[in-house]
């Protein structure tokens, strides 16, 4: 699986979409999980409704929501109030029994928001105390991870 990058802005909402073959995955519940380390397990964050026919109903776990368009074949995950610690590698999964198929590998990147400085503490190096002026910027879109790019963002 290629990794798709979704960039979101801190404090804003990010929508991640995972397309799939609706016939192949007919009747299957879906899940969104966070990869723990490069080869570690994928820790489930949220899954669709226990009744597959009700998969279109949005389910929340904290600030993360999931909803499934089972006819159109699109799983949508919404991350509300995105924070730097949300950055990392995730998976969209299709569940069958105790098994899980990966629909898409997703790298979430969290960008600073130049227009909203309510959480400005992380913008400057320690020791710097500079005033913010007035302001700009975007939304939730994706691209494929280029060859050679690191799937895990460096820690600071």
């Amino acid at each position: 699986h290629n990794t798709t990058v979704f960039q979101g802005v801190a404090g804003q909402s990010l929508q991640v979409s995972c397309p799939y073959d609706s016939m192949k995955h007919w009747g299957r519940r879906k899940a969104w999980c966070r990869q723990l380390g490069e080869k570690g397990p994928c820790q489930r964050v949220v899954s669709t409704h226990n009744l597959w026919l009700l998969s279109f109903l949005r389910r929340w776990n904290g600030s993360t929501a999931i909803t499934d368009d089972t006819l159109g074949g699109t799983l949508t995950i919404t991350l509300r109030n995105l924070q730097p610690h949300d950055a990392g590698l995730y998976q969209c999964q299709s569940l069958h029994g105790s098994e899980a198929d990966t629909l898409r590998k997703v790298l979430v990147e969290v960008l600073a928001d130049p227009l909203d400085h309510r959480d400005a503490g992380d913008l400057w190096f320690p020791g710097e105390s500079e005033s913010f002026e007035d302001a700009h910027v975007e939304h939730s879109i994706s691209r494929s991870l280029l060859e050679g790019e690191i799937p895990f963002p460096p820690t600071s």
Partner: antibody, heavy 122, light 109 residues
Framework: EVKLEESGGGLVQPGGSMKLSCTAS????????MDWVRQSPEKGLEWVAE??????????YYAESVKGRFTISRDDSKSTVYLQMNSLRTEDTGIYYC?????????????WGQGTLVTVSA | QTQSPSSLAVSAGEKVTLSCKSS????????????LAWYQQKPGQSPKLLIS???TRESGVPDRFTGSGFGTDFTLTISSVQGEDLAVYYC????????FGAGTKLELK
Amino acid sequence: EVKLEESGGGLVQPGGSMKLSCTASGFTFSDAWMDWVRQSPEKGLEWVAEIRNKVNNHATYYAESVKGRFTISRDDSKSTVYLQMNSLRTEDTGIYYCTSLYDGYYLRFAYWGQGTLVTVSA
Amino acid sequence: QTQSPSSLAVSAGEKVTLSCKSSQSVFYSSNQKNYLAWYQQKPGQSPKLLISWASTRESGVPDRFTGSGFGTDFTLTISSVQGEDLAVYYCHQYLSSLTFGAGTKLELK
């Protein structure tokens, strides 16, 4: 192909009002964050306003110099973003560009319209 | 941002270095990115994005354009200037408050 087309510019007296429109095509407009940036010989390029997408509650942001006078809005059904400008001043004169942040990467102005000239003069 | 020089007369084939200095660091430690872009504006046209994140060349931009720098000091280098490169070049920081430099005008000698 992404296209942004501004309209509504022209000559207006100080204190007057004007509404600019920008119609977009070639991308999913409802997903995009849309901005207005203006350019004048005196001030160069200057960011004016931004409106975000539905997921982000169509949040709006303004430059200090236009706050309280300008209003940015959008109509996703028409793929159009607007800039309502009231209490215009001579220093608001310039070319107004509509820009979009929709292209897979955030935070920089990847797409620009051709611009529409606004002249505020007595 | 402060751009220098304000104008520059060059000959075709020459190597050119344009400078942009920011009063505040535009580096965001959380994702290790410099929030700086470069735009090219030809007469009668709207600005065109060349470089984002200080060094990422946009699709379709010739490889003679290179962005570099970190924190507060940034450079746009054109390795061998062509006639079609004559334009005004602007830097733009998008970390805190959307601001643009005053531009550097590239002219023919």
